[in-house]
């Protein structure tokens, strides 16, 4: 309830997160024309990436372009990229949709299609759909520890969401354990009314809201966080222009004296932690 006699001030906050969990990914891997079943283990260093601000990212799906080298090649024949003569290809031109710089030649991509020759990381990335179901769908069972320190400088008051009495093996539950600061990712989605398995395919953005409504008067002191969750990106993936949440990164290596890279298009969930609230004192 609003206490008009109190002097209120907004919360100043800092957040630190730690994600835990291991995923096993089973996928078909083709090596030297032979397809076999590959088993990969993903730990925290493989699926989380440091983000700035109050955010963390968990990779739930990916598409790999392996063995890329900086050379010349026909670009991938995406829609509108095919050519029939050199006139269609402009030397030095970098089409924003392309993956390289055109040399001015129209060259065979395969037996039936021709595209502009590009100077690029080759072979250029193919336009592939994100695997369904998501490769790291078991990320639903990962947990995140959220450490949130808050401060009301005008009231000279500091506290944190983690209490000394807290059990390190607890898991947040809205009813049974609303003060536990360890959250199962699947539970966050359930609380927000979203399907983790579905969102994991293309990725998305999830908000974790931490609301501090603090009464700092000594006779009725109360200052504990309330957690709530909601999806922040456009959930209608069919209608949105660029659905989900993804980015690309590369792993570089040398093979037989040639610098190569594996390009990874990572799909996943970006969790934004939004801390707000006020501290009131007479």
């Amino acid at each position: 309830s609003d206490k008009l006699y109190q002097r209120k001030e907004p919360v100043i906050s800092s957040v630190h997160t730690k994600v835990k969990g291991i995923a096993e990914v089973t996928e078909n891997v083709t090596e030297g024309g032979v397809t076999k079943l590959g088993h990969s283990i993903f730990d925290t260093a493989d699926y989380t990436f440091p983000l700035q601000g109050n955010s963390f990212f968990v990779m739930t799906n990916y598409v790999k372009s392996e063995g890329q080298v900086q050379t010349l090649c026909p670009e991938y024949p995406r829609r509108g990229a095919q050519c029939s003569s050199d006139r269609r290809c402009k030397k030095g031109w970098m089409d924003p949709q392309s993956k390289g710089i055109q040399t001015g030649r129209c060259v065979p991509y395969d037996k039936t299609r021709k595209t502009c020759e590009v100077s690029a990381w080759c072979p250029t990335e193919e336009e592939k759909e994100a695997p369904r179901p998501a490769l790291l769908r078991s990320a639903e069972n990962f947990t995140v520890l959220i450490k949130n320190n808050i401060h009301f400088p005008g009231h000279n008051y500091t506290t944190r969401n983690i209490l000394p009495t807290m059990n390190g093996s607890c898991t947040f539950h809205k009813t049974w354990d609303p003060q536990c600061s360890i959250f199962r990712l699947g539970d966050i989605f359930q609380e927000a009314g979203e399907n983790f398995t579905e969102v994991a395919v293309q990725g998305g953005i999830m908000g974790i809201e931490i609301y501090w409504d603090c009464n700092l008067d000594s006779w009725s002191h109360h200052c504990r966080p309330r957690y709530s969750f909601r999806r922040l990106d456009d959930k209608n993936t069919d209608e949105s222009f660029v659905p989900g949440y993804n980015f690309r990164y590369a792993k570089y290596y040398k093979e037989n004296n040639v610098e190569k890279r594996t390009l990874i298009k990572a799909f996943g969930i970006r969790f934004d932690i939004l801390v707000f609230g006020t501290g009131g004192k007479f």
Epitope: T71, L72, S119, V258
Partner: nanobody, 114 residues
Amino acid sequence: KVQLVESGGGLVQAGGSLRLSCAASGSPISSYAMGWYRQAPGKPRELVARIYTGGTAWYEDSVKGRFTISRDNAQNTVYLQMNSLKSEDTAVYYCHGRVRYDYWGQGTQVTVSS
């Protein structure tokens, strides 16, 4: 560092054939695009044929149907089979590889007499 050494050039009569070879050392050619350029006296260097890692090949219009570029990844060698040679094919032929940088061979002379 990639080193390219051409061989197989020489003097041939019009209508004859030659096979140029380009032996690469320093790194495997299977990883990058390889090509053959030529330079006739007083003219700029021009691309004749290029073969890509996927196996597809490009040819300059004037040599289509007469020249064939191929690669032997095990031997780390690129070839240019030249048939039905014409006097306008006379030039110094250079092997070219692109892997981050442009690498060139020293060139081999092809002379077609009429």
